[in-house]
């Protein structure tokens, strides 16, 4: 079971409207030049196997590689969102520094890799789907780890 | 084919018990939680409660020492144990399956069983 | 406890309408609403999640939209089949788990 009380995050990081709206934009803005819609990658396989109390844990996961592997490279792209909303997401990253999982966590691992691969296989266009899915991404953390 | 079928209702006595079984195939009790939900006459959907994959469980307020959920993995299925029945406990019972997507939705769910607690 | 409110309680419509109902939360819910549709004497269906996502072999005449508290479901040109019942239900997390998921009351659409 995860160490649960390092898997939260206050709700109050969700409560300021103003990244908020910024994070739904830049996902919006990117959804418009997402040209492959039969691909989702936050959704029901994701979570495939995966506790309740696990969510967390795997939404870290997703948050940081979705930061090192997609928003840091693309990073000039989508101005002047993505220089607002790459630093709440890093703040975010770091506050679960400290979540982890005792005992095994291979169905994540599993789970997250295959979301990494997907990624991976579509080349840019995997970058800017993932970009695209931030509000996803943004609720989906919220739903997890509040 | 995923299916969830719900047996085990009928009339039951005010303070008689009864034990609601949910059997599921197409998909494994080990990888998604289950939702028992119930619909009084005319009235609208009430949540009863929840197992997860870990075989954690949580209720609705209302439900909490009444109502018990459990499973049988072995035997594809969940169960919704119901003491110290009222009258207003009439209703058909449901069961579904609760997809986590980022958030939960329940899909699909059994045809129901009724309830009916009479003397 | 979020409450939601449905409204109207029932309404009648005809063949070929567009018909709107809405779902109002008693508190911020973000988009962690869904909408459902019940036939009677069957069970529900679900239909909408992410308060705008339409579920896998849901006709596109079905839509969903809003965020925070006001929600609404719009059904673009009423078929036969679309008489029946439709409930919202929103997930609350962060709280007390014994009140995590909630049903609107319902609005019930009939042949006018």
């Known amino acids: 079971a995860p160490i649960s009380s390092h898997c939260r995050l206050d709700k109050s990081n969700f409560q300021q409207p103003y990244i908020t709206n910024r994070t739904f934009m830049l996902a919006k803005e990117a959804s418009l030049a997402d040209n492959n819609t039969d691909v989702r990658l936050i959704g029901e396989k994701l979570f495939h196997g995966v506790s309740m109390s696990e969510r967390c844990y795997l939404m870290k996961q997703v948050l940081n590689f979705t930061l090192e592997e997609v928003l840091f490279p693309q990073s000039d792209r989508f101005q002047p969102y993505m220089q607002e909303v790459v630093p709440f997401l890093a703040r975010l990253s770091n506050r679960l520094s400290t979540c982890h999982i005792e005992g095994d966590d291979l169905h994540i691992q599993r789970n997250v890799q295959k979301l990494k691969d997907t990624v991976k296989k579509l080349g840019e266009s995997g970058e800017i789907k993932a970009i695209g899915e931030l509000d996803l991404l943004f609720m989906s953390l919220r739903n997890a780890c509040i | 084919e995923v299916q969830l079928v719900e047996s085990g209702g009928g009339l039951v006595q005010p303070g008689g018990s009864l034990r609601l079984s949910c059997a599921v195939s197409?998909?494994?009790?080990?990888?998604?939680?289950m939702i028992w939900v119930r619909q009084a006459p005319g009235k609208g959907l009430e949540w009863i409660g929840i197992?997860?994959?870990?075989?954690?469980?949580y209720y609705a307020s209302w439900a909490k020492g009444r109502f018990t959920i459990s499973r049988d993995s072995s035997k594809n299925t969940v169960y919704l144990q119901m003491n110290s029945l009222r009258a207003e406990d009439t209703a058909v019972y449901y069961c579904?399956?609760?997809?986590?997507?980022?958030?939960?939705?329940?899909?699909?769910w059994g045809q129901g069983t009724l309830v009916t607690v009479s003397s | 406890a979020v409450v939601l409110t449905q409204s109207p309680s029932s309404l009648s419509a005809s063949v070929g309408d567009r018909v709107t109902i809405t779902c109002q939360a008693s508190?911020?819910?973000?988009?962690?609403l869904a909408w459902y549709q019940q036939k009677p004497g069957k069970a529900p269906k679900l239909l909408i999640y992410?308060?705008?996502t339409l579920a896998s072999g849901v006709p596109s005449r079905f839509s969903g939209s809003g965020s925070g508290t006001d929600f609404t479901l719009t059904i673009s040109s009423l078929q036969p089949e679309d008489f029946a019942t439709y409930y919202c239900?929103?997930?609350?997390?962060?709280?007390?788990?014994?009140?995590?998921?909630?049903f609107g009351g319902g609005t019930k659409v009939e042949i006018k």
């Open positions: 239900q929103a997930c609350v997390y962060g709280n007390a788990a014994d009140s995590r998921y909630t």
């Open positions: 197992i997860d994959i870990d075989g954690s469980t």
């Open positions: 992410w308060a705008s």
């Open positions: 197409g998909f494994s009790l080990s990888s998604y939680a």
């Open positions: 579904a399956r609760d997809r986590f997507v980022g958030v939960d939705i329940f899909d699909p």
């Open positions: 508190e911020d819910i973000y988009t962690n």
